[in-house]
C-alpha cells in the first residue's frame, strides 16, 4: 500500500509584486490524521506560512474548502507579494500527536518577486563647471528584482559610452539597486542639454523609465567682454559700451572703472537670450571728457556667478578736447538688445 | 458507495475472530478506516483506526487484543481474547478522525461472546 | 485520554422546536475543532452530521448546525422535524491520534 505524497507541481513560480501568489500541493492519501503547513524556508530557521489547524494567517486564503471532506489539495493563495516574500515554499504534512510531528515534505516551490526599478534618479555635480571640463553624473535606481537589468546613459539623444555601473548586492537578495557614473564633457552649448538615464528591466514590458538632469543647472559659460566707444553729438561726451556676450547663468554684476576707481557697478537685469541658451548684456558709460585733463583708463570688470572678475580695458585720449570747468563724469546706463 | 461488515458471530470467551469490511465506490488506499462498537442498548465506542502499515493505531482499551489490516478494497479487524464484554454491533466506517471524519458506515456485525 | 461529557443524556421536544445539545471535554480538543456530531436512529449506523465543529456534512439539513471551540460544544436544531427523533454523540479527538471518545450521547424524543 502506497504511503502518501506531498506533490508540490511547480518547481517554481514568478510573480508581480503587488499580485497574488498561488502555491500549488496535493496529497495522495487523507492518512495520517493531521494538518498541512505551509513554510518558506528549509530547516530549524524555516518561517511558518500557514497551519491548517491553528492560526491567523491574514494573507493566506486556501485555493480550496481545507475543510471539506476528502479535500486532498492545500493549494495556498498569498496576497499582495513584495520581493520580502521571495524564498522557497514547503507544503509539509504532519501527524497528528502531541506535538504534531512532521510525516512527509513536499519538494518546494521557489517563488521570485518581479518588483520594478524605481523611476531613476539623476544627480549632477554640487559645483558648476565650464565648457571642456568632464563632469560626472549619477544615476540611482532601487527596489527591483529580479537583478537582471540595463542601464543607458544618453546626452541629447546620443547614447554615450564612458560609465560605470553597479547592481548591489552581489549576491541573493530579496531586491537590488543600480548605481551608475557617467562622465560628460560640457560645451558651451550644453544650456539646453540633457543628460538622460534609462532603465530597462523585465518588469517593464519594454517601456524603460528614464531620470533627467538638465545641464543648464551643471554648465557655467563664462562671459567674452568686448569694450567700445562710440562718438556722441556732444563733442565733450563719449559713449563706452561694454558688451558681455555669451554667458550662463545669468548672475552677473558689473562694475566701471575709471583708472582704476569704481564709477558705477550694476547687475546684469535686461538680458537678451541666445538660442544655445546662453545670454548677452551691455552696459555702457557716458564719459565728460572735458572733466578729464590726462588720458582715462576704463575698465569693464565682470563678476560671473560668484566667480573671479574678468575686465577688459579701454583707453580714452582726453588730450584733444577743450576742458570745461565745473562738468562732471556723467553715467547713463541702460539694457541692450544685441542677440546673437 | 458504502462499506460492507461480515464474520460477525457467536465466539467463546477467550477465543477470536475476524471481521471483514468490505468497501464498494471507492477504494480504502487513500482513506482511513476506523472501528467502533456499540454494545447492546449502549452508546459508541471507538475502537482504533487502520491506516497504511505504519499508521494504525488503538484506544488505549483495545492495544494489545484488536488488530488491525486493510487492502485496497477490504479491511480487517482481527479480535483475540474476546471477553464476554466485547459483545456488540461492531461498525467500521471510513475516516481517521479531525478533518476526516467517519462519513460512510458499515450496516455493522453483531459479535457475541458468550459460552 | 479525553473524557466526553453530553447533557441532556434525554430530552423531549415538538416538531418545530429549538433543540440544544452540549458536549463538553475534559480538555481541549484538537485543533479546539476536533469534534464532530453524528445522529443514529435505532438498528441503524450512526451519520455523520458536523465534523470540524462547525461544518456541516454532504446532504445533511441547514436547519442542523454545530458550534463552539475549545472544551465547549453545542448541536443545535433550529427546527425539529419528525425524522429528527433518534440518539445524537459527540466524537472528540484529543492530541493523539488515537485519543477518540464518543459522549455518552442525548436521546431525543417526542413529546
Known amino acids: 500500500e502506497e504511503e502518501l505524497q506531498v506533490i508540490q507541481p511547480d518547481k517554481s513560480v514568478s510573480v508581480a509584486a503587488g499580485e497574488s501568489a498561488i502555491l500549488h500541493c496535493t496529497v495522495t492519501s487523507l492518512i495520517p490524521v493531521g494538518p498541512i503547513q505551509w513554510f518558506r524556508g528549509a530547516g530549524p530557521a524555516r518561517e511558518l506560512i500557514y497551519n491548517q489547524k491553528e492560526g491567523h494567517f491574514p494573507r493566506v486564503t486556501t485555493v480550496s474548502e481545507s475543510t471539506k471532506r476528502e479535500n486532498m489539495d492545500f493549494s495556498i493563495s498569498i496576497s499582495n507579494i513584495t520581493p520580502a516574500d521571495a524564498g522557497t515554499y514547503y507544503c509539509v504534512k504532519f501527524r497528528k500527536g502531541s506535538p504534531d510531528t512532521e510525516f512527509k515534505s513536499g519538494a518546494g516551490t521557489e517563488l521570485s518577486v518581479r518588483a520594478k526599478p524605481s523611476a531613476p534618479v539623476v544627480s549632477g555635480p554640487a559645483a558648476r563647471a565650464t565648457p571642456q571640463h568632464t563632469v560626472s553624473f549619477t544615476c540611482e535606481s532601487h527596489g527591483f528584482s529580479p537583478r537582471d537589468i540595463t542601464l543607458k546613459w544618453f546626452k541629447n539623444g546620443n547614447e554615450l559610452s564612458d560609465f560605470q555601473t553597479n547592481v548591489d548586492p552581489v549576491g541573493e537578495s530579496v531586491s537590488y539597486s543600480i548605481h551608475s557614473t557617467a562622465k560628460v564633457v560640457l560645451t558651451r552649448e550644453d544650456v539646453h542639454s540633457q543628460v538622460i538615464c534609462e532603465v530597462a528591466h523585465v518588469t517593464l514590458q519594454g517601456d524603460p523609465l528614464r531620470g533627467t538632469a538638465n545641464l543648464s543647472e551643471t554648465i557655467r559659460v563664462p562671459p567674452t567682454l568686448e569694450v567700445t566707444q562710440q562718438p556722441v553729438r556732444a563733442e565733450n561726451q563719449v559713449n563706452v559700451t561694454c558688451q558681455v556676450r555669451k554667458f550662463y547663468p545669468q548672475r552677473l554684476q558689473l562694475t566701471w572703472l575709471e583708472n582704476g576707481n569704481v564709477s558705477r557697478t550694476e547687475t546684469a537685469s535686461t538680458v537678451t537670450e541666445n538660442k544655445d541658451g546662453t545670454y548677452n548684456w551691455m552696459s555702457w558709460l557716458l564719459v565728460n571728457v572735458s572733466a578729464h585733463r590726462d588720458d582715462v583708463k576704463l575698465t569693464c570688470q565682470v563678476e560671473h556667478d560668484g566667480q573671479p572678475a574678468v575686465s577688459k580695458s579701454h583707453d580714452l585720449k582726453v588730450s584733444a578736447h577743450p576742458k570745461e570747468q565745473g562738468s562732471n563724469t556723467a553715467a547713463e546706463n541702460t539694457g541692450s538688445n544685441e542677440r546673437n | 458507495r458504502q462499506l460492507v461488515e461480515s464474520g460477525g458471530g457467536l465466539v467463546q470467551p477467550g477465543g477470536s475472530l475476524r471481521l471483514s469490511c468490505a468497501a464498494s465506490?471507492?477504494?480504502?488506499?487513500?482513506?482511513?478506516i476506523s472501528w467502533v462498537r456499540q454494545a447492546p442498548g449502549k452508546g459508541l465506542e471507538y475502537i482504533g483506526t487502520?491506516?497504511?502499515?505504519?499508521i494504525t493505531y488503538y484506544a488505549s482499551w483495545a492495544k494489545g487484543r484488536f488488530t488491525g489490516s486493510k487492502t485496497s478494497s477490504t479491511a480487517y479487524l482481527q479480535m483475540t481474547s474476546l471477553r464476554a464484554e466485547d459483545t456488540a454491533v461492531y461498525y467500521c466506517?471510513?475516516?481517521?478522525?479531525?478533518?476526516?471524519?467517519?462519513?460512510?458506515w458499515g450496516q455493522g456485525t453483531l459479535v457475541t461472546v458468550s459460552s | 485520554d479525553i473524557v466526553m461529557t453530553q447533557s441532556p443524556s434525554s430530552l423531549s421536544a415538538s416538531v418545530g422546536d429549538r433543540v440544544t445539545i452540549t458536549c463538553q471535554a475534559s480538555?481541549?480538543?484538537?485543533?479546539?475543532?476536533?469534534l464532530a456530531w453524528y445522529q443514529q436512529k435505532p438498528g441503524q449506523a450512526p451519520k455523520l452530521l458536523i465534523y470540524?465543529?462547525?461544518t456541516l456534512a454532504t446532504g445533511v439539513p441547514s436547519r442542523f448546525s454545530g458550534s463552539g471551540s475549545g472544551t465547549d460544544f453545542t448541536l443545535t436544531i433550529s427546527s425539529l422535524q419528525p425524522e429528527d427523533f433518534a440518539t445524537y454523540y459527540c466524537?472528540?479527538?484529543?492530541?493523539?491520534?488515537?485519543?477518540?471518545?464518543f459522549g455518552q450521547g442525548t436521546k431525543v424524543e417526542i413529546k
Open positions: 466506517a471510513r475516516g481517521s478522525a479531525w478533518n476526516d471524519p467517519f462519513d460512510y
Open positions: 465506490g471507492f477504494s480504502l488506499s487513500s482513506h482511513g
Open positions: 487502520i491506516g497504511t502499515g505504519v
Open positions: 480538555q481541549s480538543v484538537y485543533g479546539n475543532n476536533d
Open positions: 470540524l465543529a462547525s
Open positions: 466524537l472528540g479527538g484529543g492530541d493523539d491520534e488515537a485519543d477518540n471518545t
